[in-house]
Interface confidence: low
């Protein structure tokens, strides 16, 4: 039998974003009655509930979410604060009755550097390239004294050759 | 009292536009989804277009998909249908509806008088 | 896509009881649906809604003589103790995902 159908909406399926932001997980559903809507998460290590709820009704916040979700009617979740370990597949199931039910999955990617972090990157670099131009400075320094040093050991080396000639020859 | 008053019918030639209105009050508006149903003369009812409570889902019966868009402006408290191409057949009494549900797609507990569109050279 | 066949007409006497059925096509029997009554020159009243189990919520004001209920892809609706003003088309309605659908309407005339 066919059911009477849910369809499911997600205008966004991947959402990036820095940690301490809040995110919304956007979906929209139709359906003819009042479905129970499940957000799951599936980080690396298996499948965790978040929330639980029917519109219109207290949602049933898991303990690892309390404090951190807020719901909407038309089934979109919002996360408070999130940090890089929130990053996953986010899955909504909308179940209007046994046997119908849609499914759809959000991708969230949470990275640690934020706008504020880009000035210390700059400041990084600036700093790397000035121990770079020291380093290279010290190093031509380096090699031009390196360079005198040999030419006054060969200068030395050539009077000793010079004189010891002039001893054999004295000799002879 | 939840009331739908239709306004915006009339006489059209073929090809032309139209805009209907429907003005809501009773109730709170931009938490329910909105159809438009019409009836041609002597015949049954035809389901026309749906718009969900904030307007992001629509959808459109296959007979007027490409020529009508719905619409909903929630701080006037009205829906609109914006009619192009008209046809002949188009022809009907058009009736604004109200959903039992925010995203519709469901049925409708309250319905408007309507409003004559009549598509004629 | 779903189907809803209803018979063109149908008429009982005043006072009297009427049963109008609306069929649901193969498939799609476990469809709610919802009654629509739309009274000569008025614009559609909303009655009911009707779930296959035959549970049934009505709208505002409809009085408890119109009932509702089930039985396979069959929904029907009971209007006893007929009155004048019941004279009206009657129309079923179902949805499913973006779609709406009405059968073509009962016509009921309520006899003298």
């Known amino acids: 039998l066919q059911s009477q159908g849910v369809s499911l909406y997600i205008p966004q399926s991947a959402i990036n974003a820095t940690v301490q932001q809040d995110i919304l997980l956007s979906v929209d559903y139709i359906c003819h009655g009042v479905p129970t809507i499940e957000w799951k998460y599936t980080p690396n290590w298996g499948v965790q509930r978040i929330v639980e709820w029917k519109p219109g009704t207290p949602a049933n916040v898991s303990q690892s979410h309390r404090d951190r979700v807020c719901t909407f009617d038309n089934g979109s979740i919002q996360l408070f604060n999130v940090s890089v370990k929130d990053s996953g597949y986010y899955i909504v199931t909308v179940t209007e009755h046994p046997g119908s039910s849609q499914s759809g999955t959000i991708l969230l990617r949470v990275s640690e550097i934020r706008y504020e972090d880009l000035h210390f990157v700059a400041v990084f670099f600036a700093l790397l390239a000035a121990v770079a131009v020291v380093l290279i400075s010290l190093m031509w320094v380096c090699n031009q004294c390196a360079y005198k040093f040999q030419r006054k050991r060969r200068y030395k080396l050539k009077e000793s050759t010079t004189e010891e000639i002039e001893m054999k020859e004295v000799e002879c | 009292e939840v009331q739908l008053v239709e306004s915006g019918g009339g006489l059209v030639q073929p090809g032309r536009s139209l805009r209907l209105s429907c003005a809501a009050s009773g109730f709170t508006f931009s938490s329910y989804a909105m159809h438009w149903v019409r009836q041609a003369p002597g015949k049954g009812l035809e389901w026309v277009a749906v718009?969900?409570?904030?307007?992001?889902?629509?959808y459109y019966a296959d007979s007027v998909k490409g020529r009508f868009t719905i619409s909903r402006d929630n701080s006037k408290n009205t829906l609109y249908l914006q009619m192009n191409s008209l046809r002949a057949e188009d022809t009907a009494v058009y009736y604004c509806?109200?959903?039992?549900?925010?995203?519709?797609?469901?049925?409708?507990?309250?319905w408007g008088q309507g409003t004559l569109v009549t598509v004629s050279s | 896509q779903p189907v809803l066949t209803q018979s063109s007409s149908a008429s009982a006497s005043l006072g009297a009881s009427v049963k109008l059925t609306c069929s649901l096509s193969s498939g799609h029997s476990s469809y709610a649906i919802a009654w629509h009554q739309q009274q000569p020159e008025k614009g559609p009243r909303y009655l009911m809604k009707l779930n296959s189990d035959g549970s049934h919520s009505k709208g505002d004001g409809i009085p408890d003589r119109f009932s509702g209920s089930s039985s396979g892809a069959e929904r029907y609706l009971t209007i006893s103790s007929l009155q004048s003003e019941d004279e009206a088309d009657y129309y079923c309605?179902?949805?499913?995902?973006?779609?709406?659908?009405f059968g073509g309407g009962t016509k009921l005339t309520v006899l003298g």
């Open positions: 718009i969900s409570y904030d307007g992001s889902n629509k």
């Open positions: 509806a109200k959903d039992q549900y925010s995203v519709g797609a469901t049925t409708y507990d309250y």
């Open positions: 309605q179902t949805w499913g995902s973006g779609i709406q659908v």
